[in-house]
């Protein structure tokens, strides 16, 4: 099951966000999160993940995309894209599973 | 300290929504190490898991309540919210925030029981 | 969905007796996301043990969890009368999160 978290050998990571403690982290997964906000411009934040992989399964929308990779610093270059507005019917930020 | 605040009606009727707001203190709840969960006890009952929501918005929600139930998140107020709609009396419970990290649920809210009733 | 079943549904002890709670997996879990409870009447659960065997800040240390795969235990060596409550354990990091049913250790 890819989505059963576990504590098996830790991967180093680049951690660029306001919560990072320093330029790396260490954690099961590396992670990238674009997330735009209403009125804001999109932030991108890198760094660790431990639980809840199925965050990496979701799909893209408007307003968040998450990126997992499992390499040592694999997260460094990576740049992500929101999706294109969707139509009012949809909803966005939709339960992922 | 990381405290954590439920609030909103105690009492809902049958059909309607049930809203309450966790208020979250003593940490930011845009951290990406948390998890921000709700969970119900109905009376004399276990504990059921409702959803979580991650501080970009994704949410994650019980299958069994997954067409009812909406998770919000307001990270400049550092509060999510619980949307639980055409509730009836097996929804009344007390409803919990809680914190969820790699060590668990580490921290909760005291809970605030909401009835359902005309 | 993982079904966590514990037993018994109560126990009573008297203190100073050693308390073992079982919980058992429907399928092999990761022992890393296995989580431990104890709720008293009219309060919110408190985290007593996470990642099967490692305690939360503050809990004594007569408290201590075990297991792995499909069987967890949490086990109190010597009762104190503040440890007589409902216990609950828990699998967490991975959607759905789940809660076994609850062990009620009562006074004998």
């Known amino acids: 099951d890819p989505v059963k978290p576990s504590r098996g050998p830790l991967v180093t990571c680049t951690c660029e966000s306001p919560h990072c403690k320093g330029p790396t982290c260490r954690g099961a997964w590396c992670t990238v999160v674009l997330v735009r906000e209403e009125g804001r411009h999109p932030q991108e934040h890198r760094g660790c993940g431990n639980l809840h992989r199925e965050l990496c399964r979701g799909r893209p929308t408007e307003f968040v995309n998450h990126y997992c990779c499992d390499s040592h610093l694999c997260n460094h270059n990576v740049s992500l894209v929101l999706e294109a507005t969707q139509p009012p019917s949809e909803q966005p930020g939709t339960d992922g599973q | 300290q990381v405290q954590l605040q439920e609030s909103g009606p105690g009492l809902v009727k049958p059909s309607q929504t049930l809203s309450l707001t966790c208020t979250v203190s003593?940490?930011?709840?845009?951290?990406?190490?948390?998890?921000w969960n709700w969970i119900r006890q109905h009376p004399g009952k276990g504990l059921e898991w409702i959803g979580y929501?991650?501080?970009?918005?994704?949410?994650y929600y019980n299958p069994s309540l997954k067409s009812r139930v909406t998770i919000s998140v307001d990270t400049s107020k550092n509060q999510f919210s619980l949307k639980l709609s055409s509730v009836t009396a097996a929804d009344t419970a007390v409803y919990y925030c809680?914190?969820?990290?790699?060590?668990?649920?580490?921290?909760w809210g005291q809970g605030t029981l909401v009835t359902v009733s005309s | 969905e993982i079904v966590l079943t514990q037993s018994p549904g109560t126990l009573s002890l008297s203190p100073g007796e050693r308390a073992t709670l079982s919980c058992r997996a429907s399928q092999s879990v990761s022992s890393s996301y296995l989580a431990w409870y104890q709720q008293k009447p009219g309060q919110a659960p408190r985290l007593l043990i996470y990642g099967t065997s490692s305690r939360a800040t503050g809990i004594p240390d007569r408290f201590s969890g075990s297991g792995s795969g499909t069987d967890f235990t949490l086990t109190i060596s010597r009762l104190e009368p503040e440890d007589f409550a409902v216990y609950y354990c828990?699998?967490?990091?991975?959607?759905?999160?789940?809660f076994g049913q609850g062990t009620r250790l009562e006074i004998k």
């Open positions: 809680a914190r969820e990290s790699v060590a668990g649920f580490d921290y």
């Open positions: 929501i991650y501080y970009s918005g994704s949410t």
């Open positions: 828990q699998v967490y990091g991975s959607v759905p999160i789940t």
């Open positions: 003593g940490g930011s709840i845009s951290s990406g190490e948390y998890y």
